[in-house]
């Protein structure tokens, strides 16, 4: 099943997020992703946990998953590089870099997103955009078109409360509020964008969605700048 959902959001403006990628397994949407360089997509390591025998591809330039669009193109994956410290049973280091079989053809609907290199927390309350093709309600309806939602960043102390994530949120993670509007599992690997810059990647750990006491968890890309640079080099 696809990992992820946008709850309480709305349909995104078509092709207004040209960095948005759909990581696909055997032709079906699995996870979100974000184009960070001409030939590289950043996603979540857990997305490929169950993909050992399947064909992994990356869809760029899409708004609708099913309808033909001039900008849409499906790329094979030359190399998948999960973060070396990612593990199945933790949310830590949940990053994955996918090298496309060739450089993406760039244009208005396909463009890499600048990512944050300065290792400093986003101020609590900052509104950030998260997008994805995950299910849109608790009944499990899957959208065909890209959805998005604006979420306020939550301070780490609140996110670390026992009734929230009880100390699991390290300095390399950040949280966003989850009161009915939320990202969740299948949006895993998708981008959290603050002020036009990639700040976080949706983690793919299992959690309740849309419950304000269980905020969304995002991997802070700035904390992994050295690793990203070393893989892209």
């Amino acid at each position: 099943p696809p990992r992820g959902r946008i709850l309480g959001g709305r349909e995104a403006e078509a092709h207004a997020r040209p960095y948005m990628a759909s990581v696909q397994l055997n032709g079906a949407h699995l996870c979100g992703g974000v184009l960070v360089a001409e030939q590289w997509v950043l996603s979540a390591a857990h997305c490929l946990e169950d993909a050992a025998d399947g064909k992994v591809q990356v869809l760029l330039g899409a708004h609708s998953l099913s309808q033909p669009e001039p900008s849409k193109r499906l790329y094979d994956v030359l190399r998948a590089v999960p973060h070396p410290d990612s593990q199945p049973d933790t949310i830590d280091h949940d990053l994955l870099l996918l090298q496309l079989s060739e450089k993406a053809t760039l244009g208005p609907a396909v463009r890499p997103l600048p990512w944050q290199r300065v290792d400093r927390d986003v101020a609590p309350g900052t509104l950030c955009d998260v997008a994805g093709w995950g299910i849109v309600n608790h009944a499990g309806r899957r959208p065909d078109s890209l959805q998005h939602v604006l979420l306020p960043v939550l301070d780490r102390a609140t996110c670390n409360r026992r009734t929230h994530h009880d100390g699991a949120i390290t300095e390399r993670l950040m949280c966003a509020e989850s009161n009915r509007r939320d990202s969740c599992k299948g949006d895993s690997g998708g981008p959290l964008v603050c002020g036009g810059v990639l700040e976080g990647v949706v983690t793919s750990g299992s959690r309740v969605c849309g419950n304000r006491k269980k905020p969304g968890i995002y991997t802070r890309v700035a904390s992994y700048a050295a690793w990203i640079d070393s893989v892209l080099a």
Epitope: P124, D155, R156, A157, T158, N160, R161, R162, T163, D166, G167, I169, E171, V208, N211, K213, K214
Partner: antibody
Amino acid sequence: EVQLQQSGPELVKPGASVKISCKASGYTFTDHYMNWVKQSHGKSLEWIGDINPNNGGTSCNQKFKGKATLTVDKSSSTAYMELRSLTSGDSAVYYCTREGASFAFWGQGTLVTVSA
Amino acid sequence: DVLMTQTPLSLPVSLGDQASISCRSSQSIVHSNGDTYLEWYLQKPGQSPKLLIYKVSNRFSGVPDRFSGSGSGTDFTLKISRVEAEDLGVYYCFQGSHVPVTFGAGTKLELK
């Protein structure tokens, strides 16, 4: 290694105030709420309140409203609790404890004795 | 406030015995997020309390597997399969689901 170092014992007169401190080290101070707990001699534990070091926001047990004031100094990674209008009933050991991984980390306690 | 009632208040044991401590809350401590924030702490004389069990049955890191927690709703139990000398002290149950968070009165585990 997470450590919470509390200030030393206090002997204070009835009606006076006292301010005790809890200096945090081994983690980022603003990443966790700090809680305060009272333990009267030979008795159980009572939660006083908590504070978010990011913004100074506090939540207090109704029983300690007007008695305890919680503050933080982010620059020194220190939490403070001021107790005012002290009576013999305030004589106790006071603990700070970090929230996040439940209350896994506690200070060593500060003994406050109220006596004329 | 949620009242946490522990029984017994004193539990004399011999080393190697199994020990069982009960904790009952005055109302359900299932949080609105679905989790139950029932914890157990051990306090030895002159020391700060130490976390043993969180969310009813999860052992905190470094806690020996002779400690186990169980229960649901309002009734909870801490079991020590074979008591060792280092286990002696006062055990407190705690609920973190409702504000104000509250502790039980404590159970003193002591040698017979």
